[in-house]
């Protein structure tokens, strides 16, 4: 049984030029997190694996900084970065917890951080 | 240049172990994880799991694990691959690999280690 | 495990030919595939990663292509020196798997 919970950052908004942190929590949960896998739609972003670190897919390597901890730091942001972004974490016993992000980039200067929500 | 010089061909009897080296040189060996990849003759690749060379942190394939074990000196720049319990299947070529930096895909092979297990 | 098929098994092709190989993988992997080749008592060599960089001084006739569950490798016009088995490989979630490979001959 999965009992684990998701806290993400929500529905954040950034400047466009400026970076963003996404970060996943995972919660309630003693299950061992073995990978995390971050995704956009269905672009394959970033991968932290526990013991064999970052991998970055070479269409974000630019653009993209692994960290802090298990999160993706966005850099450079355009306004095509706007969409749902995912923290896939896959865990031994558990199996896969998904989280979601969804990041607004502004071209003006009042982005402001949303609410942190939870996903079960 | 990089290189991955593995050492020579071992004849084990099943049930014994074969610990394989693979002594690196030409690049900074703590800053990139280091794999073993298998390949019975004639037969595809098969992964058998991979070591941070920093942390000593490691993953294994699930098939080998409790089989397996992944060490590194970091002294000597050298990974090391023990296989215990050796069956006949266990003959096969292993392959040290390194990977890209932060990108999971191997970029230089050792030039594989011959380990037969015969009675 | 993630399962990566390769087809054909093998592959007879003229010279200055074009050579197709597939690989399917039994489940998403997004762009998290590389494409391997072997000569015989080599070890493989990098050709194709994130299912379509060619890897540092790789002759533009490879290319790759693909994402999801399906990946083709592609040699445009076949030279002698590429007679090998070539092996697709996933890298989405451990533990990283291969395809069974696919010999590619001069017919």
């Known amino acids: 049984m999965m009992t684990g919970t998701i806290e993400t950052t929500g529905n954040i908004s950034a400047e466009k030029g400026g970076s963003i942190i996404l970060q996943c929590h995972l919660s309630s949960t003693t299950a061992q997190v073995t990978q995390v896998n971050w995704e956009q739609q269905d672009q394959l972003l970033a991968i932290c694996n526990a013991d064999l670190g970052w991998h970055i897919s070479p269409s974000f390597k630019d653009r993209v900084a692994p960290g802090p901890g298990l999160g993706l730091t966005l850099q450079s942001l355009t306004v095509n970065d706007t969409g749902e972004y995912f923290c896939i974490y896959h865990t031994y016993p558990d199996g896969t917890y998904t989280g979601r992000i969804f990041l607004e980039v502004l071209e003006s200067s009042v982005a402001e951080h949303g609410a942190r929500f939870q996903i079960p | 240049q990089v290189q991955l010089v593995q050492s020579g061909a071992e004849v084990k009897k099943p049930g014994a172990s074969v610990k394989v080296s693979c002594k690196t040189s030409?690049?900074?060996?703590?800053?990139?994880?280091m794999h073993w990849v298998r390949q019975a003759p004639g037969q595809g690749l098969e992964w058998m799991g991979g070591?941070?060379?920093?942390?000593?942190?490691?993953t294994y394939n699930q098939k080998f694990q409790g089989r397996v074990t992944l060490t590194v000196d970091k002294s000597s720049s050298t990974a090391y691959m023990e296989l215990s319990r050796l069956r006949s299947d266990d003959t096969v070529v292993y392959y040290c690999?390194?990977?890209?930096?932060?990108?999971?895909?191997?970029?230089?092979w050792g030039q594989g280690t011959l380990v037969t297990v015969s009675s | 495990d993630i399962v990566m098929t390769q087809s054909p098994d093998s592959l007879a092709v003229s010279l200055g030919e074009r050579a197709t190989i597939n690989c399917k993988a039994s489940?998403?992997?997004?762009?998290?595939v590389a494409w391997y080749q072997q000569k015989p008592g080599q070890p493989p060599k990098l050709l194709i990663y994130?299912?379509?960089y060619r890897y540092t001084g790789v002759p533009d006739r490879f290319s790759g292509s693909g994402s999801g569950t399906d990946f083709t490798l592609t040699i445009s016009s076949l030279q002698a020196e590429d007679v090998a088995v070539y092996y697709c490989?996933?890298?989405?979630?451990?533990?990283?798997?291969f395809g069974g490979g696919t010999k590619v001959e001069i017919k």
């Open positions: 690999a390194k990977l890209l930096r932060l990108m999971y895909y191997f970029d230089y």
């Open positions: 030409g690049y900074a060996f703590t800053e990139y994880t």
């Open positions: 070591i941070n060379p920093n942390t000593g942190g490691t």
């Open positions: 489940q998403d992997v997004r762009t998290a």
């Open positions: 994130s299912a379509s």
């Open positions: 490989h996933q890298h989405y979630i451990t533990p990283w798997t």
